[in-house]
Interface confidence: medium
């Protein structure tokens, strides 16, 4: 059990021209709030897949009204953390989706309206119990700065919050802020949050909010001395001299990222997100020009017109960001046809097609006729996931297996007599009429109203319908 915590530091227009001045539409003032969604694993999932690890909604921020002449500020944000509790093990790898919503406060028929301003998705590896990871993400013209961490609660400990820790009751030789490294206790990394003021040296708790004293100490906060003291758990390497855990530095402690870069922990290392104009492992390289090759993923670098934008990256399809460092959500272009579900796998797009459709983009209507032959010379016509037979004359039914009487509809006009034939029907016309259906009268002088009859056919002869 534990809780994922997200702290939004700022949300505002990103750098560069074309950035929006205000999140509010022309209809009037608005206020912002955030929605966080956690999904397990690092794979790209469909947008509609559920937030299986949980989700949370922030409070609404203060009302914002655009000041026409004022520079676009960072926008007023809701107070507090967004917390997503999880009951089971923390998976370690997860997808973090942060949505910025605006609530429009103009007059709305039927109540308020929400509009989605920006969505960022981050696939991360994160151990529970670690320090805050900081990040900067751009979504369209907006920039979002945030920190996040996962921590265990109650008696759960470990990087996945799966182990239970039973605090020692015996005093030890450890000094303040250190914890005994007894056998079977080396996973007891993160004790619960005790009552405010509870002595870190002489108190402990098994449930949040309580304060229980080690032997030799007393009082509501375990501050009245009577005996030797013990210590409570901090994460870190073992101290050989005391047998206690000492706090260990995390990769991002002290922020190794220079020039305003933000640090994110990665397994055994860190990653810096650099502001525009800086790059390098620690954002230590400045004064970037096209000669430095700042455009990633095959982006085309063009020199900027002013010192504030020394270069501009023109990104290839599928990438965006000031350095083409971000992969575009290609599914937003809705490439899958015929109702197919789009999956962006990073290296490729995949469409999961509805029944009856196939192809890379579900563009092909499956051959519904496969294995469904039409009998008696009928032709199969595909469409919409079901097959249909166009039957030869004289046959009918779903598969053309039923013999149809071609004379049933009385096709011979003017009293002509109908004869069923293997390839259709033959009309024997009454005197004075001709044609495949006896539809043409013959003139008294023996000349047809039509052009001359084909050779070998005389007016009044039976006409076979081909």
């Amino acid at each position: 059990a534990g809780v994922f915590e997200l702290q939004i530091h700022s949300f505002g227009p990103g750098p560069g021209p074309g950035a929006p001045r205000s999140p509010c539409s022309a209809r009037g003032p608005c206020r912002l709030f955030f929605r966080v969604c956690l999904k397990p694993g690092l794979s790209e999932e469909a947008a509609e897949s559920p937030c299986a690890l949980g989700a949370a909604l922030s409070a609404r921020g203060p009302v914002y009204t655009e000041q026409p002449e004022a520079p676009a500020p960072d926008l007023p944000l809701p107070n507090g953390l967004l917390q997503v509790p999880f009951r089971d093990a923390w998976p370690g790898t997860f997808s973090l989706i942060i949505e910025t919503w605006r609530e429009e406060l103009g007059d709305q028929i039927g109540g308020p309206a929400w509009s989605l301003l920006a969505r960022v998705t981050r696939r991360r590896r994160l151990a529970a119990g670690g320090p805050w990871a900081r990040d900067i993400q751009r979504a369209g013209a907006w920039e979002l700065r945030f920190s996040y961490r996962a921590r265990c609660e109650l008696l759960a400990v470990g990087t996945a919050c799966t182990r239970l820790c039973r605090p020692r009751s015996a005093p030890s030789r450890c000094g303040p802020g250190l914890r005994p490294c007894a056998p079977l206790e080396d996973e007891c990394e993160a004790p619960p949050v005790c009552r405010a003021g509870c002595s870190l040296e002489h108190g402990f708790c098994e449930q949040p909010g309580e304060c229980r004293c080690l032997e030799g100490w007393t009082g509501p906060l375990c501050t009245v001395p009577a005996s030797t003291s013990s210590c409570l758990g901090l994460r870190g390497p073992s101290s050989a001299t005391t047998g206690c855990l000492v706090p260990g530095p995390g990769p991002c402690d002290g922020n190794p990222c220079a020039n305003g870069g933000s640090c994110s922990e990665t397994p055994g290392s860190f990653e810096c997100t650099c502001p525009r104009g800086f790059y390098g492992l620690r954002c230590e390289v400045s004064g970037v020009t096209c000669a430095d090759g700042p455009c990633f993923n095959g982006g085309l670098c063009v020199g900027g017109a002013d010192p504030d934008s020394a270069y501009i990256c023109h990104c290839p399809p599928g990438f965006q960001g000031s350095n083409c460092e971000k992969r575009v959500d290609r599914c937003s272009l809705q490439p899958c046809r015929n109702g197919g579900l789009c999956l962006d796998l990073g290296h490729a797009l995949r469409c999961r097609c509805r029944a009856g459709f196939a192809g890379p983009r579900c563009e092909h209507n499956l051959d519904d006729c496969a294995g469904r032959a039409c009998a008696n010379g009928g032709t199969c016509v595909e469409g919409g996931g079901a097959h249909r037979c166009s039957c030869a004359l004289g046959f009918g039914g779903r598969d053309c297996r039923e013999r149809a009487d071609p004379c049933a509809a009385r096709p011979c006009a003017h009293g002509g007599r109908c004869y069923a034939h293997f390839s259709g029907l033959v009309c024997a016309c009454a005197p004075g009429y001709m044609g495949s259906r006896c539809e043409f009268p013959v003139h008294p002088d023996g000349v047809s109203a039509l052009p001359a009859a084909p050779p070998g056919l005389r007016p009044g002869d039976p006409q076979r319908y081909l």
Epitope: F33, R35, V36, C37, A47, E48, C51, G54, A55, A56, L57, S58, A59, R60, V84, I97, E99, W101, Q108, G110, G111, P112, A113, W114, S115, L116, R119
Partner: nanobody
């Protein structure tokens, strides 16, 4: 399977009070909304009040502001609607609903029925003058 079960409806005199309850089973509404809607005979279903899972965001229809209070109990997965100073025009079938913006929505209305994909069977509230 998601089920929403309303209770607490009944008949009351104008000026009286009722408390409606809606228990959700098979549905975790973290990050989403649960709310109350009502439908009077020959009228469209309208939003009354909605609340998010943390209780940090609530919305009320103008016609019930100051008289109705929505609250929730996460442990019990239950939402309540406390209705005070009831009026005859509050007479309607009251429905509990659960939903919220999906991840691909770009616009969502907390007090309109299309924003909710799970509905209860309803409980009747009758206010006589």
């Amino acid at each position: 399977e998601v089920q929403l079960a309303e209770s607490g409806g009944g008949s009351v005199q104008a000026g009286g009070s009722l408390r409606l309850s809606c228990a959700a089973s098979g549905y975790t509404y973290r990050s989403n909304f649960m709310g109350w809607f009502r439908q009077a005979p020959a009228k469209e279903r309208e939003g009354v009040a909605t609340i998010d899972s943390r209780g940090t965001i609530t919305y009320y229809a103008d016609s019930v502001k100051g008289r109705f209070t929505i609250s929730q109990d996460n442990e019990k997965n239950t939402v309540y609607l406390q209705m005070n100073s009831l009026k005859p025009e509050d007479t309607a079938m009251y429905y509990c609903a659960a939903g919220g913006p999906r991840t691909n929505d770009d616009r969502w209305y907390p007090l309109r029925p299309p924003g909710y994909n799970y509905w209860g069977q309803g409980t009747q509230v009758t206010v006589s003058s």
